[in-house]
């Protein structure tokens, strides 16, 4: 058997570190037999087999030039094997975020903070957190942990299926390359980090008769469970072509009547999403929709007091929604009140109520 | 059963040093923050030391720095306190604790020990 | 890392409630939201009643409360029990040296 040990990655490759002492082990002979050692190619002897280092061939302070295939002879000539030298870094603790559309599953992804350049593979786990009491400590319930299965399609993303909206959950995300590994830890909680798509189909129609008016209307996204348990609520936002600034309202339901568009002018629309006891955030926008209020006989227009008029937000132009006030919470916020970074590597608590 | 089993204590001199064990059953270790803390006779509670569930990050308390040494085998199921150079006032029970801590995308935090081991006695005398 | 402030007794009735204070900084009790609570029996280890200033692990009666304002956290132990007589100790995250900070200790006893 070979004296070498195999490292995570290709056969035949072993692996070191630049500007370190990097040591390469003769793949065929028997751990303590003296080789001699070659840089493939070239006749130049590297290390001879009187050297004391046995099978092993010792490069102080690597660098780029080392790279590459060496051969190694034992003392009747007969080759010992070909070794190539790759050198790289060890993995640093991988950039971790996990996003969810629904209140049943979450999505993990990542991405090194540093290149090594090496091969490198992650680990990916989570398990749900408990804080026993002294009395209830002598049987803790399955809290995993559980592998979080990847994307078979190879992106740098986890899926955890069948999260429970009120628990929190720890994800571990651990970089693997042949000098070691490193994890990275994240606590997450679906209400915190709950997200949903924008709303779909949005659809704006004039209101025949009425020149001031315009009707939008919009479906659930279709990531948002089919029968929910947890309910959206909506911001619809819209203005005038050409006019800067949009107006919002915070329809009751799956439309709104708008009952000040501006006679005769085109009118972009546009709606977001977001859990109706606030948890998370709000959705990205919706694709605008485009609609024009109706030309024809007029009615009179009577002051609709049951429709929210619309409130004129000065010059909101970019593109994300100024922040939502603050959600309720039955509990503190457990992360720091201030933005330092004590050490490696935190859940916002929500209630519905 | 969720479980920690200290042991190593007993009677040193000034000077002397101790390697005390925690034994954890009942739970993944690996994934858990873990700590000591002691109680001298008679005393309130100190926070001695604290590590992360890798091992890669350790906090002490400015009373045992530089002296103890907190350390992990998680293929064990293992915590250790290292005691080097102990004075008197190191007396104390030794309690082994487990922490869920906190992790941001960017740190972990301390949080709270929901489970404690029964204590292990530690006596610096001559 | 300088121990948090409690007072050395409480005291009150069966049946009556509690409270006691634990004062600290802006850099660990005011500054996070890791504020920690445990009762300890005499010859005991300690048991956690309270964590992240507020919350009760499972187990925990509802008897027991915690809350916080600026640099001082509070546990209230109301309907005193005689089985509540017991030392109380606050804890937090110390913000240095990821380092953690216990109080000074509260005897509390239940009279009668």
């Known amino acids: 058997s070979s004296p070498c040990p195999q490292a995570w990655g290709p056969p035949g490759v072993q692996y070191g570190q630049p500007g370190r002492s990097v040591k390469l082990c003769c793949p065929g002979v028997t751990a303590g037999d003296p080789v001699s050692w070659f840089r493939d190619g070239e006749p130049k002897l590297l290390q001879g087999p009187d050297s004391g280092l046995g099978h092993e061939l010792v490069l102080a302070q690597a660098d780029s030039t080392d790279e590459g295939t060496y051969i190694c002879q034992t003392l009747d000539g007969a080759l010992g094997g070909t070794v190539t030298l790759q050198l790289g870094y060890p993995p640093a603790r991988p950039v971790v975020s996990c996003q969810a559309a629904d209140y049943e599953n979450f999505s993990c992804t990542w991405s090194p903070s540093q290149i090594s350049g090496l091969p490198t593979r992650y680990l990916t786990s989570y398990r749900k957190k408990t804080v026993l009491g002294a009395d209830s400590q002598r049987r803790s319930p399955s809290t995993g942990p559980w592998p979080c299965p990847q994307d078979p399609l190879g992106a740098a993303r986890c899926v955890v299926h069948g999260a429970e909206f009120w628990s929190q959950y720890r994800i571990n995300v651990t970089e693997v390359n042949p000098l070691g590994a490193s994890t990275r830890l994240l606590d997450v909680s679906l209400q915190s980090i709950l997200r949903p798509d924008p709303p779909q189909g949005l659809r704006v129609e004039s209101v025949p008769g009425y020149p001031r008016r315009l009707r939008a209307s919009w479906t659930y996204p279709a990531s948002w469970p089919s029968q929910p348990h947890f309910l959206l609520k909506f911001r619809l936002q819209y203005r005038p072509a050409q006019h800067p600034a949009w107006s919002t309202v915070e329809p009751a339901g799956l439309e709104e009547v708008i009952t000040d568009a501006v006679a005769g002018l085109p009118h972009a629309v546009r709606v977001s999403a977001r859990d109706f006891l606030d948890a998370g955030t709000w959705s990205t926008w919706s694709p605008e929709a485009w609609g024009t209020p109706s030309t024809g006989p007029l009615q009179d227009e009577i002051p609709d007091w049951s429709q929210g008029h619309g409130q004129q937000l000065e010059a909101v132009v970019a593109q994300e929604d100024s922040p939502a006030p603050a959600r309720p919470s039955l509990q503190p916020d457990p992360r720091p009140l201030d933005h330092r970074d004590p050490l490696e590597q935190h859940h916002h608590h929500h209630h519905h109520h | 059963e969720v479980q920690l089993l200290e042991s190593g204590g007993g009677l040193v001199q000034p000077g002397g040093s101790l390697r005390l064990s925690c034994a954890a059953s009942g739970f993944t270790f690996s994934w858990y923050f873990m700590g000591w803390v002691r109680q001298a006779p008679g005393k309130g509670l100190e926070w001695v030391s604290y590590i992360y569930p890798s091992g890669g990050s350790t906090g002490y308390a400015d009373s045992v720095k530089g002296r103890f040494t907190i350390s992990r085998d998680n293929s064990k199921n293992t915590l250790y306190l290292q005691m080097h150079s102990l004075r008197a006032e190191d007396t104390a029970v030794y309690y082994c604790?487990?922490?869920?801590?906190?992790?941001?995308?960017?740190?972990?935090?301390?949080?709270?020990?929901?489970?404690w081991g029964q204590g292990t006695m530690v006596t610096v005398s001559s | 890392q300088s121990a948090l402030t409690q007072p050395p007794s409480a005291s009150g009735s069966p049946g009556q409630s509690v409270a006691i204070s634990c004062t600290g900084t802006?850099?660990?009790?005011?500054?996070?939201?890791?504020v920690s609570w445990y009762q300890q029996h005499p010859g005991k280890a300690p048991k956690l009643l309270i964590y992240e200033v507020t919350k009760r692990p499972s187990g925990v009666p509802d008897r027991f409360s915690g809350s916080k304002a600026g640099n001082t956290a509070s546990l209230t132990v109301s309907g005193l029990q005689a089985e509540d007589e017991a030392d109380y100790y606050c804890?937090?995250?110390?913000?240095?040296?990821?380092?953690?900070?216990f109080g000074t200790g509260t005897k509390v006893t239940v009279l009668g």
């Open positions: 802006s850099s660990d009790v005011g500054g996070y939201n890791f």
């Open positions: 604790a487990r922490d869920e801590g906190y992790c941001s995308s960017t740190s972990c935090y301390f949080d709270a020990f929901d489970i």
């Open positions: 804890s937090s995250y110390g913000g240095s040296n990821n380092a953690g900070v």
